[in-house]
Interface confidence: low
């Protein structure tokens, strides 16, 4: 108990000093990421820019719990995720054997006091194809790149076009058509396309971090999670080494 | 104003049980997270056991796992701890609490009873 509150306690030396009384603090996430099928992947969120102790987090995807993490019963995962789902490191969350139905939105939800309830949003998406890992740590070199060879392919489909313009008129039609294909797989796959029609992604429910700030009798009842969980004698939370 | 009233408590030996109840004023249950707490001598007051407003989901602290058992009459507005096979450690106040939101963490609860004495003599 006190090396939890000394945790706590620590947390809150590394925030920086603001006025009381507000809900100064604000949420960094890994954002939108990818994985690849049967992978893993860290799900990660850090609360900066308050003074607030961090009493709890809980791990959620959609509408459904998947980890909590108290400051003093310490880590408590989801029976249903408990092969896959693997606490920390530090207030994070691993994922693991990733499928296609694990895609969606996740949120990390901290409770403070006194600031109260901070929810973070993640977007997983998990892919079929090997592109993923590359996409989760190169999604800015790879579209740069990914639009850098669009324009020259554009660029050099445009000469040829102004050089044979009126001699090959249906050959150019079928190099614009397999442009056309080549440019829309390569968007399919990008770690930052939206989700294509009929894929995993679960919208019908409304998201849980909302439950914080509404307190509705729907999601009062939602977070009464205490069936569904499994305690795990993994110590107290890290409070204070999360690398968000 | 939300009152919670615990009785049931005694002296025991160890290996025998207890059944604690905790009476609330007006209909509170079907709003109200219900939660057991102890506290021992010179110890922090800790968490034994909830039961959610439905009644359905309940949840225990490692320690009484297996032992005790928490359990809600709607109709009589009362919320049982069934403990079984009583430990001398087990030895503590309990307090009976209800929360309208938060989690299972002492700080959550809203209302709090008087508490009842709990001794288990070796």
């Known amino acids: 108990m006190r090396w939890c509150l000394l945790l706590i306690w620590a947390q809150g030396l590394r925030q920086a000093p603001l006025a009381s009384g507000m809900m100064t603090g604000t949420i960094e996430t890994t954002g939108n990421i990818s994985a690849e099928k049967g992978g893993s992947i860290i799900l990660q969120c850090h609360l900066s820019s308050t003074t607030a102790q961090v009493t709890q987090v809980n791990w959620e995807q959609q509408d459904q719990l998947l980890a909590i993490c108290n400051a003093d019963l310490g880590w408590h995962i989801s029976p249903s995720f408990k092969d896959r789902v693997a606490p920390g490191p530090g207030l994070g969350l691993t994922l693991q054997s990733l499928t296609v139905n694990d895609t969606g939105e996740y949120f990390c939800i901290y409770h403070t006091y006194p600031d109260g309830t901070y929810t973070g949003r993640i977007f997983l998406e998990v892919l079929e194809s090997s592109v993923a890992e590359h996409g989760a740590r190169f999604q800015i070199p790879l579209l740069g790149a990914m639009a850098a060879t669009l324009v020259v392919i554009c660029t050099a489909v445009i000469v040829v076009v102004a050089l044979t313009r009126k001699k090959k008129a249906l050959r150019i039609h079928s190099v614009e058509g397999d442009l056309r294909r080549k440019s829309a797989g390569q968007e399919e796959w990008s770690p930052s396309a939206p989700s294509p029609p009929g894929s995993c992604v679960q919208a019908e429910a409304a998201p849980a971090g909302l439950c914080g700030e509404q307190r509705g009798e729907d999601c009062a009842e939602l977070h009464d999670y205490f069936n569904v969980l499994s305690y795990r004698s993994l110590g107290n939370c890290s409070f204070f080494t999360e690398t968000g | 104003e939300v009152q919670l009233v615990e009785s049931g408590g005694g002296l025991v030996q160890a290996g025998g049980s207890l059944r604690l109840s905790c009476a609330a004023s007006?209909?509170?249950?079907?709003?109200?997270?219900m939660g057991w707490f102890r506290q021992a001598p010179g110890k922090e007051r800790e968490f034994v056991s909830t039961?959610?407003?439905?009644?359905?989901?309940?949840y225990y602290a490692d320690s009484v796992k297996g032992r005790f058992t928490i359990s809600a009459d709607n109709a009589k507005n009362t919320v049982y701890l069934q403990m079984n096979s009583l430990k001398p450690e087990d030895t503590a106040v309990y307090y009976c609490?209800?929360?309208?939101?938060?989690?299972?963490?002492?700080?959550?609860?809203?209302?709090w009873g008087q508490g009842t004495q709990v001794t288990v003599s070796s």
């Open positions: 007006g209909s509170i249950l079907s709003s109200y997270t």
């Open positions: 039961i959610s407003r439905s009644s359905t989901r309940t």
């Open positions: 609490a209800a929360r309208l939101w938060g989690t299972w963490t002492a700080g959550d609860y809203d209302y």
